[in-house]
Interface confidence: low
C-alpha cells in the first residue's frame, strides 16, 4: 500500500503515525496548495488541527479581510490559520469545533460544538456551529444563528456600529454579540473591565479578557 | 409588560447641561445593557453611549466623550445619561434601548435591541 503524503488534516496525520504534537503541512482540498497547522495531538484523543490560538499577545490580532482569509501569525505560537482554508476544508466532511479557555486565575474550560462549518468568502464566511457541551457555559458565546466575519476593513456584522474597529480583531461579529477570541490581549492585572478584550461572554462574564485560548477542529467520525 | 420609558430632555443653552433617565418596568435592568441612541429628522440613528449589565463598563461615541456620562441605579432600575457642556449638535430625538440577551455589554450600539423608549427631545440652543 502506497503511503500517504499529502494530508488535509491533522487526523489524517495521526491516522497515518504521527502521534506527536507539531508543524505539520496540510494541503487544500482538491488542490497542491499547502498550509502549515498545528496539530494537537495529545487533547482528547488527538488529531486537532488548531486554527486559532492566543497566549501572550505577541502577534497582531486586528488584522484585514486578506491576512484573516490566508491566516497569519506563528503555528508554534500565536496564530490564525485562515478563513479560506477552514471553509474549504469543513466544507468537504463534517467536523467538529473543540474551543479551549484559560483565565488569569488557573481555570480552564471548554465548548466543544458537534457540527462547525465556515461557508465560502462569497457568504463572509459565515460560521454554522451545532451542537454545544462543555464547561464554558451552557450558552452559546458564538451568536446563534452564525454570523458573517468581520474585519477592521470588512463591516459584516449586524451592528450600526463597526464591532471590528470598536472591539479589534476580526471575528464573527453579531451587534456585537457575547465573544471575541481575536480581541486586544491585556496581560494579568489589566484584564478586567476591558471592552476590546478576548471574551467568552458565557463563561466569565462582561469585560473579562482570558489568558489563552485554542480553537481546533476535527473530523466527526474520527 | 416591559417598558423603557426616557425623560429630561427639554431646551437648553450652549454650554448648558441636562440629565436624561431611562427608566424601566415589566423586568430588571440590571441583568441588560442599557444604551442611549439619538436621532436627527432625516439622518441615520446614532449610538451615543451605553452600559454593560453587571461591571458598569461604558462606552461613548467619540463626539461626546467627556462631556457625556452614563450611569445606572439599578435599585431604582434607571439608568441616566449626564450630558454636559452641550452643544448645538447635539440636538436630536435621544432614545433608550436594552437587549433581552443580555450580552451586547461590548458594542453598545447594536441592532440588537429590542426594548425601545418612545423618545425625549433635546433641543440646544440659544
Known amino acids: 500500500k502506497e503511503e500517504q503524503t499529502t494530508f488535509r488534516d491533522c487526523a489524517e496525520i495521526f491516522k497515518s503515525g504521527l502521534t506527536t504534537s507539531g508543524i505539520y503541512t496540510l494541503t487544500f482540498p482538491n488542490s497542491t496548495e499547502e498550509i502549515k497547522a498545528y496539530c494537537d495531538m495529545d487533547v482528547g484523543g488527538g488529531g486537532w488541527t488548531v486554527i486559532q490560538h492566543r497566549e501572550d499577545g505577541s502577534v497582531d490580532f486586528q488584522r484585514t479581510w486578506k491576512e484573516y482569509k490566508e491566516g497569519f501569525g506563528s503555528p508554534l505560537g500565536e496564530y490564525w490559520l485562515g478563513n479560506e482554508f477552514v471553509s474549504q476544508l469543513t466544507g468537504q466532511h463534517r467536523y467538529v469545533l473543540k474551543i479551549q479557555l484559560k483565565d488569569w486565575e488557573g481555570n480552564e474550560a471548554h465548548s466543544l460544538y458537534d457540527h462547525f462549518y465556515l461557508a465560502g468568502e462569497e457568504s463572509n464566511y459565515r460560521i454554522h456551529l451545532t451542537g454545544l457541551t462543555g464547561t464554558a457555559g451552557k450558552i452559546s458565546s458564538i451568536s446563534q444563528p452564525g454570523s458573517d466575519f468581520s474585519t477592521k476593513d470588512s463591516d459584516n456584522d449586524k451592528c450600526i456600529c463597526k464591532c471590528s474597529q470598536m472591539l479589534s480583531g476580526g471575528w464573527w461579529f453579531d451587534a456585537c454579540g457575547p465573544s471575541n477570541l481575536n480581541g486586544q490581549y491585556y496581560p494579568q492585572k489589566q484584564n478586567t473591565n476591558k471592552f476590546n478584550g478576548i471574551k467568552w461572554y458565557y463563561w466569565k462574564g462582561s469585560g473579562y479578557s482570558l489568558k489563552a485560548t485554542t480553537m481546533m477542529i476535527r473530523p466527526a467520525d474520527f | 409588560e416591559v417598558q423603557l420609558v426616557e425623560s429630561g430632555g427639554g431646551l437648553v443653552q450652549p454650554g448648558g447641561s441636562l440629565r436624561l433617565s431611562c427608566a424601566a418596568s415589566?423586568?430588571?435592568?440590571?441583568?441588560?445593557?442599557i444604551g442611549w441612541f439619538r436621532q436627527v429628522p432625516g439622518k441615520e440613528r446614532e449610538g451615543v453611549s451605553c452600559?454593560?449589565?453587571?461591571?458598569?463598563?461604558?462606552y461613548y461615541v467619540d463626539s461626546v466623550k467627556g462631556r457625556f456620562t452614563i450611569s445606572r441605579d439599578n435599585a431604582k432600575n434607571t439608568v441616566y445619561l449626564q450630558m454636559n457642556s452641550l452643544k448645538p449638535e447635539d440636538t436630536a430625538v435621544y432614545y433608550c434601548?436594552?437587549?433581552?440577551?443580555?450580552?451586547?455589554?461590548?458594542?453598545?450600539?447594536?441592532?440588537?435591541?429590542?426594548?425601545w423608549g418612545q423618545g425625549t427631545q433635546v433641543t440646544v440652543s440659544s
Open positions: 434601548a436594552t437587549d433581552s440577551g443580555g450580552y451586547i455589554d461590548y458594542d453598545c450600539m447594536g441592532l440588537g435591541y429590542d426594548y
Open positions: 415589566g423586568f430588571a435592568l440590571d441583568y441588560y445593557a
Open positions: 452600559i454593560s449589565s453587571s461591571d458598569g463598563i461604558t
